[in-house]
C-alpha cells in the first residue's frame, strides 16, 4: 500500500498535502513545511514531522535533564534541516547563526557554537529508553500482559519489528520500554526506533500523527492503561560532547 488510493490521503501522516499527481494518477503525498514526498506505507521521519510542525508553530516545551550520556530533548521545538532522505542533517543552525550538532533523532549532542562549528557525521541514536508513569489502577498490571500489549502497539501501530523492542520493564507505576537498533541490524524498510518513539510520544500526548485513526487505546487484558508522565532518554553510538561547564550546571 501507499497512500489510500480511494480518497488520496496519507494514513501514517496527517501533516501532508496529497493529490493524484503521481505516476499513472497515483496518489502522492508531500510533507508540509518541506514539500518532500513521503512514503505513506510507513512512518514519516521525525525530521520531516518536526519541519511540518514548525509550519504551524506552537509554544516550545522543555523536559527534565537526565545524567550521564543519556540525552533528553531539552531544547524543545526547532525548524530542522533535513537531508534528501528526510534524516536530520548533522549540523543544525537557527536564524541567528547559532549552530549545534544533533544525533539521528534530532536531539542536540554538543554545546551551541557559531557557523564555524563542524559536525562530521550524523551520530546514530541506537538505544532509546521510554520512561512512563501510569495513572493509579486497582492493582498492578500483569508484567507479561503489559509486555505483550506494548509490543503489539509498536508492531501494529508503529510497524516496528519486535526484535527492536529489547525489553519492557515494570515496577508499578513505572513502565520502561527499551528500544535498540544498531546500524548493522537496521535493514532497508525497517522503521527507525527514533521515528517510532516520536510517534509514540505524540500519541501519548493526544497529538496523534495518524490520519483519521482513533487516538491511542492502550488496554492490558481489557484494563485501560493511562499514561500521566513520559520521559524519553536517548543514547548514541558515540557519547555526546558537552563542555564540563554544562555537565556540572
Amino acid at each position: 500500500h501507499t497512500a489510500a488510493q480511494d480518497n488520496c490521503t496519507c494514513p501514517t501522516n496527517k501533516m501532508t498535502v496529497c493529490s493524484p499527481d503521481g505516476p499513472g494518477g497515483r496518489c502522492q503525498c508531500r510533507a508540509l513545511g518541506s514539500g518532500m514526498a513521503v512514503d505513506c506505507s510507513t512512518l514519516t521521519s521525525k525530521c520531516l514531522l518536526l519541519k511540518a510542525r514548525m509550519s504551524a508553530p506552537k509554544n516550545a516545551r522543555t523536559l527534565v535533564r537526565p545524567s550521564e550520556h543519556a540525552l533528553v530533548d531539552n531544547d524543545g521545538l526547532y525548524d530542522p534541516d533535513c537531508d534528501p532522505e528526510g534524516r536530520f542533517k548533522a549540523r543544525q543552525c537557527n536564524q541567528t547563526s547559532v549552530c549545534w550538532c544533533v544525533n539521528s533523532v534530532g536531539v542536540r549532542r554538543t554545546d551551541k557554537g557559531d557557523l564555524s562549528l563542524r559536525c562530521d557525521e550524523l551520530v546514530r541514536t541506537h538505544h532509546i529508553l521510554i520512561d512512563l508513569r501510569h495513572r493509579p489502577t486497582a492493582g498492578a498490571f500483569n508484567h507479561s500482559d503489559l509486555d505483550a500489549e506494548l509490543r503489539r502497539l509498536f508492531r501494529e501501530r508503529y510497524r516496528l519489528h519486535p526484535k527492536f523492542v529489547a525489553a519492557v520493564h515494570y515496577e508499578q507505576p513505572t513502565i520502561q520500554i527499551e528500544l535498540r537498533q544498531n546500524t548493522s541490524q537496521k535493514a532497508a524498510g525497517d522503521v527507525d526506533i527514533g521515528d517510532a518513539a516520536y510517534y509514540f510520544e505524540r500519541d501519548i500526548k493526544g497529538e496523534s500523527l495518524f490520519q483519521g485513526r482513533g487516538g491511542l487505546d492502550l488496554r492490558v487484558r481489557g484494563e485501560p492503561l493511562q499514561v500521566e508522565r513520559t520521559l524519553i532518554y536517548y543514547l548514541d553510538e558515540i557519547p555526546p560532547k558537552f563542555s564540563m561547564k554544562r555537565l556540572t550546571a
Partner: antibody, heavy 118, light 111 residues
C-alpha cells in the same frame, strides 16, 4: 475466547486462483493482525503473509506476485487470495494470530485443505 | 532467508524418559538479549500449537514438562518426562528476520 474460522474450496484447477475467508471472533481486526501460513506435503510450514490492524500488508517475497490479503473489519473477516496455483501449491492453509507479539503464532484457524489438480 | 534445520526427523523415546529435540539456525536469531525462536506441537489433522515462545518462555496452559533453551543458532526443546499424549511432530520457528521460517519438524514416537 479467541477463534479463527476458515472457509474455502478444497479443490482448485491448475492456473486458477484460491480464495479463503478467515472469520475471527473474540478480538477485533482493528487491533490485531492476521497471518497466513501453509503446510505443504514436501515443504513443512511456510509463512505467506500478514494483514496488520491498520490494513497494511507484508508478504513473503516468494509469493508477493500472486498473493493478496484484504479484510473487512466490520464483518471480522480476512480474505486470502492466491493466483496461478500449481500442483505444488497443494497443502493446508491456515490463518493465525500473534498474542505475545514476538513473532509467534499463538492462535490458529482449523486449516483449509487445498488440492490443486485437474 | 534464515534456514532452520531439525536434523532428527524422527525420535523414539520411552515413556517417562527425556526427549531432546534440536533446532539449528543458519544465522543468529538473537537480538538485544532476546532469542526469537518458538516451538510448536502438531498432531495429525490439527493446526500447530504454540508451546514455547522466545526460546524459553512457556506458553500459558502448557505443562511444565516442556522447556526450551539455547541462544544464537542452537536451540533445544526438552520434554521431561515424556507422556503418551506427547506423540506428535514438533517444529521450531524463527521471527528475527522476515520472512518468518520454520524447521522441517521432528516426529516424536514412543519406544
Amino acid at each position: 475466547e479467541v477463534q479463527l474460522e476458515q472457509s474455502g474450496p478444497g479443490l482448485v484447477q491448475p492456473s486458477q486462483s484460491l480464495s479463503i475467508t478467515c472469520t475471527v471472533s473474540g478480538f477485533s481486526l482493528t487491533r490485531y493482525g492476521v497471518h497466513w501460513v501453509r503446510q505443504s506435503p514436501g515443504r513443512s510450514l511456510e509463512w505467506l503473509g500478514v494483514i496488520w490492524s491498520g490494513g497494511n500488508t507484508d508478504y513473503n517475497a516468494a509469493f508477493i506476485s500472486r498473493l493478496t490479503i484484504t479484510k473487512d473489519n466490520s464483518k471480522s473477516q480476512v480474505f486470502f487470495k492466491m493466483n496461478s496455483l500449481q500442483p505444488n501449491d497443494t497443502g493446508v492453509y491456515y490463518c493465525a494470530r500473534e498474542d505475545r507479539y514476538v513473532g509467534e503464532f499463538a492462535y490458529w484457524g482449523q486449516g483449509t485443505l487445498v488440492t490443486v489438480s485437474a | 532467508d534464515i534456514v532452520l534445520t531439525q536434523s532428527t526427523a524422527s525420535l523414539a523415546v520411552s515413556l517417562g524418559q527425556r526427549a531432546t529435540i534440536s533446532c539449528r539456525a543458519s544465522e543468529s536469531v538473537d537480538s538485544y538479549g532476546n532469542s526469537f525462536i518458538h516451538w510448536y506441537q502438531q498432531k495429525p489433522g490439527q493446526p500447530p500449537k504454540l508451546l514455547i515462545y522466545r526460546a524459553s518462555n512457556l506458553e500459558s496452559g502448557i505443562p511444565a514438562r516442556f522447556s526450551g533453551s539455547g541462544s544464537r543458532t542452537d536451540f533445544t526443546l526438552t520434554i521431561n518426562p515424556v507422556e503418551a499424549d506427547d506423540v506428535a511432530t514438533y517444529y521450531c520457528q524463527q521471527s528475527n528476520e522476515d520472512p518468518r521460517t520454520f524447521g522441517g519438524g521432528t516426529k516424536l514416537e514412543i519406544k
